[in-house]
Amino acid sequence: RTTTCFGDGCQNTASRCKNGGTWDGLKCQCPNLYYGELCEEVVSSIDIGPPETISAQMELTVTVTSVKFTEELKNHSSQEFQEFKQTFTEQMNIVYSGIPEYVGVNITKLRLGSVVVEHDVLLRTKYTPEYKTVLDNATEVVKEKITKVTTQQIMINDICSDMMCFNTTGTQVQNITVTQYDPEEDCRKMAKEYGDYFVVEYRDQKPYCISPCEPGFSVSKNCNLGKCQMSLSGPQCLCVTTETHWYSGETCNQGTQKSLVYGHHHHHH
């Protein structure tokens, strides 16, 4: 946020940039949290825009019994590995086809034991405040589906009649990692020393990091004709004086008519 300065007073302004603002020859360049000619004002809204999507990664191991392990499968650039990857990916795409969050699989390692496939199942969902629940549910469905397929697609008399067959007991879920996104934490951090006064409110499922000085939210402070200003002790209303009235009170709701004061009378509305 920048405010431009013209005229002779600019040199003086340069040395007075506050709150870590820097002079660029024309104006104070303010850090994210501040604005104003001297960076003296605290912003009332901080952009903590969430990522468009949130990802999860499940580390799984399955044992493929319909393929015999050969040394070439250790080499990820070999034709054998590439063919295995292709078939395994096709098979897993079928297994997980009903899961909207499913993105694909990534083989990390193949090892002996028929073929033990260490791989990641990749999940992704659009960001909503309920993303954790959505991804938790998806990981449960992944577990159900892989358990089912590795129980059903098995070798009979050393022959597999499916694209791939599995060892029922060789299926394991090692780890589940969900990209963490905590808007409240981000809001607190970005608000720095004002963190106690900034809160997250949702509008159309999007989080907004705001102070009570930001209008239009449930926490917004109504300063009436005054101006809301953030200080280290919290939001405060700076009351205005008009041609006819002085305003006072915590929310500038007490108006005193000047003419009455001059006539030694107080009148509140």
Epitope: S66, K68, E72, Q79, E80, E83, E90, C160, C165
Partner: nanobody
Framework: DVQLVESGGGLVQPGGSLRLSCAAS????????MAWFRQAPGKEREGVAF???????SYAESVKGRFTISRDNAKNSLYLQMNSLRAEDTAVYYC?????????????????WGQGTMVTVSS
Amino acid sequence: DVQLVESGGGLVQPGGSLRLSCAASGFPSSRGTMAWFRQAPGKEREGVAFINSDGRTSYAESVKGRFTISRDNAKNSLYLQMNSLRAEDTAVYYCAASLLYLMTVNAAAYPYWGQGTMVTVSS
């Protein structure tokens, strides 16, 4: 590029014999798995027999004892000797291959395919 070309199909009387061949180019026939599949009109493609790089073979129940699969690594070729042929053996026969040591008769596991050769068993 892998190319598989089948030959040897034709018309034969019930009880007769045929030998199908599959010439593989760009495919190391000493590796992986080679197989024969067939598809009768209006039916799904089914596995007939496969042979692995170590010579291990497997056959569909319907052809056991009548058909023999073999491969000649020196000639990069696959063969299917078909004896005691029946009317129900009528189909297009396909040669298929995989670089992997497979133990499956599912067509989806085989990435390389020939164009097929027609076998008709009829009197």
